[in-house]
Amino acid sequence: AITEAREEAKPYPLFPGPFPGSLQTDHTPLLSLPHASGYQPALMFSPTQPGRPHTGNVAIPQVTSVESKPLPPLAFKHTVGHIILSEHKGVKFNCSISVPNIYQDTTISWWKDGKELLGAHHAITQFYPDDEVTAIIASFSITSVQRSDNGSYICKMKINNEEIVSDPIYIEVQGLPHFTKQPESMNVTRNTAFNLTCQAVGPPEPVNIFWVQNSSRVNEQPEKSPSVLTVPGLTEMAVFSCEAHNDKGLTVSKGVQINIKAIPSPPTEVSIRNSTAHSILISWVPGFDGYSPFRNCSIQVKEADPLSNGSVMIFNTSALPHLYQIKQLQALANYSIGVSCMNEIGWSAVSPWILASTTEGAPSVAPLNVTVFLNESSDNVDIRWMKPPTKQQDGELVGYRISHVWQSAGISKELLEEVGQNGSRARISVQVHNATCTVRIAAVTRGGVGPFSDPVKIFIPAHGWVDYAPSSTPAPGNADPVLII
């Protein structure tokens, strides 16, 4: 390690000649005042004055001898002012002071950059007593210095509530450059310029930067740290790093991969999670995102029936959660389904198409042209209807459900009849005379019961009345059902 020691300032004596018990032989008093302190010999405490803050790094002891002669001021001796060494080397430095024996319990504390160093530091204080003074040497050692050990170290000693402070010892730990900012991995648009930043510090300074792209140096001459590299654009993935050089050597940053954004790969594993008569719940596994987040997805649905017109239904959805319920489908139908997703660059190709089917549903319309008439001779009500259009049966008809409600004099009762799918007529027994019978019919598939037709009412007279003409549901688009007598 290089050690730079400042020349020691020659102290000047406050009194002519050495005082008794001096450890030195060069006629320089042990308790001496460095020029640097700026202390004036005239500023001395009288024995009766209370203590006041010291000036500089010197304290004037208040105690006087039997002859009332004041003691000279106390100060730390000059030492090395600046130590430069390499990282991981050991260092030891010290403060020394000579203190008259009249003072008891003198302790020296070490401070770094204004903070006291406590605990696990290798600080040793040694005392060398003599007749009148004790030489105190406080040593501080660091076995393997790190950058964090850089700083200004001082010793402090308290005597009679006065603080004596040493000159600072500057420790400068030098080593290889240390990165404070390294290039970051990025995903960039093809052929578009972007910036990378690299910053490293010493000591020693200066730190110079070289950029490397795919093992080739980008700048053949160094640039002072910090350095910003403008990459003029890429057509394919590249790896960048930066080299930081100082007088101690070279440090290389981590290599970062710069990827080129591209359209995503198509989704995979499109699967059917659930089917109903009119909806299919699908899920998919997204493909590779092309180094750019997915924005949304498109579900394409086409009828698999060879006789269909081949039109495609498109449903747009968010990219998450890779799940979509396709609605408004026909019951008992086959569909081909494909999924495509997009990022900022564009749409992926469509996934492999999958086949899916909707289940049987309850019919979506009621039977048509419902007519009702009274067959008085057999005491029955005859009902006729037309089956709903095949497209709207939403499955295979298994029959019909007939609701007939009988109302007279505040009494009402509803009865339900099930009828097989073959017929389009039914006969029900008259339940109550002198009453109104309201009839509604619904088609039934294995998927469930469809909607009931609009009600058709017929009045059932008391026995002996004449036959009535039939009642019927109006043709589609007409007004409410009417009772025809």
Epitope: N191, W211, Q213, N214, S216, V218, N219, E220, Q221, P222, E223, L229, T230, P232, G233, T235, A238
Partner: antibody, heavy 118, light 106 residues
Framework: QIQLVQSGSELKKPGASVKVSCKAS????????MNWVRQAPGQGLKWMGW????????TYADDFKGRFVFSLDTSVSTAYLQISSLKAEDTAVYFC???????????WGQGTLVTVSS | EIVLTQSPDFQSVTPKEKVTITCRAS?????MHWYQQKPDQSPKPWIK???NLASGVPSRFSGSGSGTDFTLTINSLEAEDAATYYC?????????FGQGTKLEIK
């Protein structure tokens, strides 16, 4: 603005030496390396090598090792190309050009014609 | 070293015509630069790093390519474009230039 100004044309006899200068202005000379490029009459461009203006270290392309020397005088922001033991085939225009990122030659001197003839 | 082969060597073109000059590298390179040179002048930087037009270059010029195949395109040739165009690779030392393509106006 950035300029590279080269010395004038030279007529030399075979075996002689020549020193071409390239004076830079408008930028910090030591920030960019200096390339040398040769163009023989009616021919294309051929990279001869470059000199690091920060360290003074030259790099020569294989065809230009031996008789060719790149040097600098940073105090006057000038790069030099010296050719010794001149041959007839050294007759060419010699260009200096700045060395930017990605070996982009952003600025060129006007060229110096060196003619070697007995 | 990487050899750059330009084609064509020479082309005589009428104004307003579209011109394409190709530069093929013997191995993959990261970037291709292009320079324009007119008789008795020094080369001018023309297209930097494959596709970036140098300052003052008209927008009718464009550059593209990657790997080993690169092109300089002039969308609608003008008389002032008559010159020799050189490609130069970055990525592998030594730096090399193509042999040049001379464009002449008919």
């Amino acid at each position: 603005q950035i300029q590279l100004v080269q010395s004038g044309s030279e007529l030399k006899k075979p075996g002689a030496s020549v020193k071409v200068s390239c004076k830079a202005s408008g930028y910090t000379f030591t920030n960019y390396g200096m390339n040398w490029v040769r163009q023989a009459p009616g021919q294309g461009l051929k990279w001869m090598g470059w000199i690091n203006t920060y360290t003074g270290e030259p790099t020569y392309a294989d065809d230009f090792k031996g008789r060719f020397v790149f040097s600098l005088d940073t105090s006057v922001s000038t790069a030099y190309l010296q050719i010794s033991s001149l041959k007839a085939e050294d007759t060419a225009v010699y260009f200096c050009a700045t060395y930017g990122h990605y070996a982009w030659f952003a600025y060129w001197g006007q060229g110096t014609l060196v003619t070697v003839s007995s | 070293e990487i050899v750059l082969t330009q084609s064509p060597d020479f082309q005589s073109v009428t104004p307003k015509e579209k011109v394409t000059i190709t530069c093929r590298a013997s191995s993959s390179v990261s970037y291709m630069h292009w320079y324009q040179q007119k008789p008795d002048q020094s080369p001018k930087p023309w297209i930097k790093a494959t596709s970036n037009l140098a300052s003052g270059v008209p927008s009718r010029f464009s550059g593209s390519g990657s790997g080993t195949d690169f092109t300089l395109t002039i969308n609608s040739l003008e008389a002032e474009d008559a010159a020799t165009y050189y490609c130069q690779q970055w990525g592998t030392k030594p730096l090399t230039f193509g042999q040049g393509t001379k464009l002449e106006i008919k």
